[in-house]
């Protein structure tokens, strides 16, 4: 489909005569009829197979024809065709005189013809005008012509239909030859396929519009090149979707079990050494001077009760100092100032001189103990029950009542979080569903009974016979410093008078 365009430029009829030689009265009011047809070697009358067109009266005798394409579109003349342009044509242009206003052929006298020209030849489709001039005896016509394709038709013969579009069916404009030229971001035969974001993974990503990257199931990331691990995967990665491969130090199906608690949490304090002991558990080996599950508690040197014979221990910057009760001396109150002459052994104990009578030792009868045989033997004194077990005297034997989470004859086997004796200062450990709780003895508080809240053990005036009372800060018990002539843990016994014990 296209248009044959004919641009009339100038018509010369100086004498104002018709083809017959007769002059026009008053002048030749000239209009044109154009016939376009298929190529003929000799142009002959007959049907105008490619089309016809007529002009109105354009002038009288000689005149130039104004380019009127912008106004009404009458010059150039348009001869549209709805077929493939064959490349050849025949053209007949007739100039006629119009005596009146009726320009129909049947309304004109037969001798109203002014001139007739006929040309034929080949003509390629193109934008360029071909200029021609035809002269007869009395007239001259100057004109130009060309063939162009209609809108949306392209190619050498205007046979290629191409309509630019930007919708679901395609995104393109048309090239001069009628081929499609895709709009930016589109590709494919009909420019229907979007060009995805640069780098978007070919298999794992796709797009519905240009510069987009939508991920297929199991993939994520800007370029859809990262797999999605299995739902619930905690400390793991994947190489294909829905896997869960554990990071170093993690275990379990969902990599949620800490196999390296020491590295991940650094629980041990004060330079202690941490050892992993299975999932979510660890053991701290404390440096000297520290205690507690995490070695968080600083040990007092008095905690080991180094003072003997009722001596009171005092912490000092460079160690400790024992305050000895009357009758004892030495670094640990281990030496006695009494001798066997003072009858220091109670409850039938036998006195033996030592160091040439400088001190003595008591040999106690069964069921009595102490440096002066002053204490009844408590089979629980040695505290045989581990892990805070309660020792019960049962006649000649003893038994241990274990705290929750411990078992065995001496409560030495642990079955719970309380196994590591996390509660300081004799605190009682209780297993809870997710942890433990310490019940602290009088004088201590804190999560692990590590905070001392001092109690004055002397407040109840336990010492007799005007003895001086000292509070032992390490055990929150008292020590009585006896005046001369009295002995016993409360200075209740006069020296030389064996007491009568109620048991």
């Amino acid at each position: 489909s296209g248009v044959f365009q004919l641009q009339l430029q100038e018509f010369i009829n100086e004498r104002g005569v018709l083809a017959s030689g007769r002059p026009c009265e008053p002048g030749c009011r000239t209009f044109f009829r154009v016939c376009l047809k298929h190529f003929q070697a000799v142009v002959s009358p007959g049907p105008c197979t490619f089309g016809t067109v007529s002009t109105p009266v354009l002038g009288t005798n000689s005149f130039a024809v104004r380019d009127d394409s912008s106004g009404g579109g009458r010059n150039p003349l348009q001869l549209p065709f709805n077929f493939t342009w064959p490349g050849t044509f025949s053209l007949i242009i007739e100039a006629w005189h119009a005596p009146g206003d009726d320009l129909r052929p049947e309304a004109l006298p037969p001798d109203a013809l002014i001139s007739k020209i006929a040309i034929q030849g080949s003509l390629a489709v193109g934008q360029n005008w071909l200029l021609d001039e035809q002269t007869s005896t009395l007239t001259r016509l100057r004109y130009s012509y060309r063939v162009i394709c209609s809108d949306n038709y392209y190619g050498d013969n205007c046979s290629r239909l191409c309509k630019k579009r930007n919708d679901h069916f395609g995104h393109y404009v048309c090239q001069p030859d009628g081929n499609l030229s895709c709009l930016p971001g589109w590709t494919g035969e009909y420019c229907q396929q979007p060009i995805c974001l640069s780098g978007c993974h070919e298999q794992n990503g796709y797009c519905s519009k240009p510069a987009e990257c939508l991920c297929r199931p199991g993939w994520q990331g800007r370029l859809c090149n990262e797999c999605i691990p299995h739902n619930g995967c905690r400390h793991g990665t994947c190489s294909t979707p829905w896997q869960c491969t554990c990071d170093e130090g993690w275990g379990g199906l969902f990599c949620d079990q800490d196999l390296n608690y020491c590295t991940h949490h650094s629980p041990c304090k004060n330079g202690a050494t941490c050892s992993n002991s299975g999932q979510r558990s660890y053991t701290c080996t404390c440096r000297p001077g520290y205690t507690g599950v995490d070695c968080e508690l600083e040990l007092s040197e008095c905690d080991s009760n180094p003072c003997r014979n009722g001596g009171s221990c005092k912490d000092q910057e460079d160690g400790y100092h024992c305050l000895c009760p009357p009758g004892y001396y030495g670094l640990h109150c281990e030496h006695s100032t009494l001798s066997c002459a003072d009858s220091p052994c109670f409850n039938g104990g036998s006195c033996r001189e030592r160091n040439q009578g400088a001190n003595y030792a008591c040999e106690c009868p069964p069921n009595f103990t102490g440096s002066n045989c002053e204490k009844k033997v408590d089979r629980c004194t040695s505290n045989p029950c581990a892990n805070g077990g309660q020792c019960l005297n049962r006649g000649p034997s003893r038994m241990c009542r274990c705290r929750p989470g411990f078992t065995g004859t001496y409560c030495e086997l642990h079955v719970s979080d309380c196994a590591r004796n996390p509660c300081a200062h004799g605190g009682t450990c209780h297993d809870l569903e997710n942890g433990l709780m310490c019940t602290c003895p009088a004088g201590f508080s804190g999560r692990r009974c590590e905070v001392r809240t001092s109690i004055d053990a002397c407040a109840s005036s336990p010492c007799f016979n005007r003895a001086t009372c000292y509070t032992d800060l390490s055990t929150d018990t008292f020590v009585c410093n006896c005046p001369y002539g009295f002995v016993g843990s409360r200075c209740e016994f006069p020296v030389g008078l064996p007491p009568s014990f109620p048991w």
Epitope: Q243, C244, T245, L253, C255
Partner: nanobody, 120 residues
Framework: EVQLVESGGGLVQPGGSLRLSCTAS????????IGWFRQAPGKEPEGISC????????YYADSVKGRFTTSRDSAKNTVYLQMNSLKPEDTAVYYC?????????????WGQGTQVTVSS
């Protein structure tokens, strides 16, 4: 192709027992750890037990410790999950899974699952 097929699920009353089986194929059974995880509607999956390739190392989630037991039978290429003292909160789809290695460290393959419903 690695395949894990679970069976043995069903409806059971609270306090009751069930034994789930997981039959494996497509790989050398003795070289992979195999475990169980479960997923209740609207919840994240929970790893409940896993037994190493040798059968010597087995771990259990706190929620099932003392009630569930995992064992493996190499002759039958099967892993079992014995579930006792079942509670309503044990209701879930139970899946058999393997990390594709000897240790219980991750998931690479898993089965279609078997439904366990604990209700009176």
């Amino acid at each position: 192709e690695v395949q894990l097929v679970e069976s043995g699920g069903g409806l059971v009353q609270p306090g009751g027992s069930l034994r789930l089986s997981c039959t494996a194929s497509g790989f050398t059974f003795d070289v992979y750890a195999i475990g169980w995880f479960r997923q209740a509607p609207g919840k994240e999956p929970e790893g409940i037990s896993c037994i190493s390739s040798s059968g010597s190392i087995t771990y259990y989630a706190d929620s099932v410790k003392g009630r569930f037991t995992t064992s493996r039978d190499s002759a039958k290429n099967t892993v079992y999950l014995q579930m006792n003292s079942l509670k309503p909160e044990d209701t879930a789809v139970y899946y058999c899974a393997t990390p594709g290695i000897a240790a219980c460290r991750g998931i690479h393959y898993w089965g279609q699952g078997t439904q366990v419903t604990v209700s009176s």
